[in-house]
Interface confidence: medium
């Protein structure tokens, strides 16, 4: 058993049929010695008396908020949550495996630039009685500060018969050094509590590996006189790190015909303009990637040729 | 470069960008492999890193690029020695068309661009871990290439910025 926060405790249980469970001793936080009784949750049933209560925690029915009373007055509370371990593996019932980039990916994180700011998100099909708490640091043995904001419900989607909920959190490294080579990874720890079930999820990454620029902006087409060609231009996204002479992007451009089956020629360039043949009904698209490190490509930015 | 003269920024830019391409083609899948393990915080100290105080940020380069260039050169020599060591030359043998050979030569080329003949900056001691098992060697190759990718990315940014803003 360990303390998650004041008056909230997590009992770690090996979860299998007829498991013996864990013996837990609760102590009433009061100088009083006599006339103390214990109840669980809203039931008025007295579970025991005395300054301490010893219970055998085996299942969710044994978890909840234990309260010690004297003379009808509540003296202190202890909330017990359960953390299940099945076949030596902690349960992951609350969050959905996103399977990208590999199996057992419950948390996904992205950064738009090297400022030390990043966003993580996760998915669940649970809609109520759910709470999350996030902590983050750089490194684990001598952790450096990362500050995370409040968790928000960022999207709801219907998947077949089920509703899926996406939660996200934004974090910022306290003393980010955008130009340095990261030596220690960022660690993100998410506590998830559903009713009285506790689970925790972790992710470890370097900012450089989760970079995904925003799409290029201000796509413009300028037809060239007496030619089928057009000059296309675009700009770095506003959210990308500066100066651009240092934090450079490379671009992939393509012209896509109306038919998805039509062959697409992709061209790679470090410049922010190009000359292409842009037929009627086609569209021109461009995406960006860090020029010197192969992290994710941005989403496409597109503009119609006509 | 030593003693305060400017490097050939444009040449260094071209060669460092080539290094980035080679480092990723040497093991493109490395990007999708989770090679971090327990105790990695200690093992990552074995390779030189371009850190916050090394003056490799745009402001630091404007103030005095020498600190940063010396740091980059130390790292290049370190990786050049590693790529020429038993870790990469031993079993399992690299494929004949492996870009590691080109990567090795380019590391040497860039470090020499930063130190013309006759100048000798002191370089740090190069550790020579010699894992006995081929699988250990393979894992170490991945880890070295992974950290090299990060190192040369910063070096390439430095030279691109230098070429754009510090060239005479």
């Amino acid at each position: 058993i360990w303390e998650l926060k004041k008056d909230v405790y997590v009992v770690e249980l090996d979860w299998y049929p007829d498991a013996p469970g864990e013996m837990v001793v609760l102590t009433c936080d009061t100088p009083e010695e006599d006339g103390i009784t214990w109840t669980l949750d809203q039931s008025g049933e007295v579970l025991g008396s005395g300054k301490t209560l010893t219970i055998q925690v085996k299942e969710f029915g044994d978890a909840g908020q234990y309260t010690c009373h004297k003379g009808g007055e509540a003296l202190s509370h202890s909330l017990l949550l359960l953390h299940k371990k099945e076949d030596g593996i902690w349960s992951t019932d609350v969050l959905k495996d996103q399977k990208e980039p590999k199996n057992k990916t419950f948390l996904r994180c992205e950064a738009k630039n090297y400022s030390g700011r990043f966003t993580c998100w996760w998915l669940t099909t649970i809609s109520t009685d759910l709470t999350f708490s996030v902590k983050s640091s750089r490194g684990s043995s001598n952790p450096q500060g990362v500050t995370c904001g409040a968790v928000t419900l960022s999207a709801e989607r219907v998947r077949g018969d089920n509703k899926e909920y996406e939660y996200s959190v934004e974090c910022q490294e306290d003393s980010a050094c955008p130009a340095a080579e990261e030596r220690l990874p960022i660690e993100v720890m998410v506590d998830a509590i559903h009713k009285l079930k506790y689970e925790n999820y972790t992710s470890s990454f370097f900012i450089r590996d989760i970079i995904k620029p925003d799409p290029p902006k201000n796509l413009q087409l300028k037809p060239l006189k007496n030619s089928r060609q057009v000059e296309v231009s675009w700009e770095y996204p506003d959210t990308w790190s500066t100066p651009h002479s240092y934090f450079s992007l490379t671009f992939c451009i393509q012209v896509q015909g109306k038919s998805k089956r039509e062959k697409k020629d992709r061209i790679f360039t470090d410049k922010t303009s190009a000359t292409v043949i842009c037929r009627k009904n086609a569209s021109f698209s461009v995406q960006a990637q860090d020029r010197y490190y192969s992290s994710s490509w941005s989403e496409w930015a597109s503009v119609p040729c006509s | 470069v030593p003693g305060g003269s400017s490097p050939a920024w444009a040449q260094c830019q071209q060669l460092s960008q080539k290094l980035c391409t080679l480092a990723w083609s040497a093991h493109p899948l490395v990007g999708h492999m989770d090679l971090r393990e327990e105790g990695d915080e200690e093992t990552t100290n074995d390779v030189p890193h371009i850190q916050c105080g090394d003056g490799c940020d745009p402001q630091g380069l404007r103030d005095n690029s020498q600190f940063c260039l010396q740091r980059i050169r130390q790292g290049l020599i370190f990786y050049e020695k590693l790529l020429g060591s038993d870790i990469f030359t031993g079993e399992p043998s690299l494929l004949p068309d492996s870009p590691v050979g080109q990567l090795h030569a380019s590391l040497l080329g860039l470090s020499q661009l930063l130190q013309p003949e006759g100048h000798h900056w002191e370089t740090q001691q190069i550790p020579s871990p010699s894992p006995s098992q081929p699988w250990q060697r393979l894992l170490l190759r991945f880890k070295i290439l992974r950290s090299l990718q990060a190192f040369v990315a910063v070096a390439a940014r430095v030279f691109a910025h230098g070429a754009a803003t510090l060239s005479p």
Partner: nanobody
Amino acid sequence: EVQLVESGGGLAQAGGSLRLSCAPSGRAFSGSAMGWFRQVPGKEREFVGVIIWTGGYTYYADSVKGRFTISRDSAKNTVYLQMDSLKPEDTAVYYCAARTPNSSWFPTTLYEYDYWGQGTQVTVSS
């Protein structure tokens, strides 16, 4: 949009009791946390206590523990703050706050709450 309406404030003697109510309207509150805060002029709003709507689990600031009790009536969609053994230093404007979905187990800081009531004045005379 969620509105929170507090009631029950007023004047009480030291050692006496008051019961505040907070009724959220405009949205069902399943799975959220409902908190109470208080503020005296010139000071920052201070956490008093919170109840997790489903389950009725409660958490209190040390300064009120044992004297104040938060409860909820699901049928009436109302949260209560029962204040016993009142002290003059409990004098403040009391605010009800709500969080959906709650961002931490027992949210205790201002920024974790999405919705706030207008506040109700509680004065304790010695």
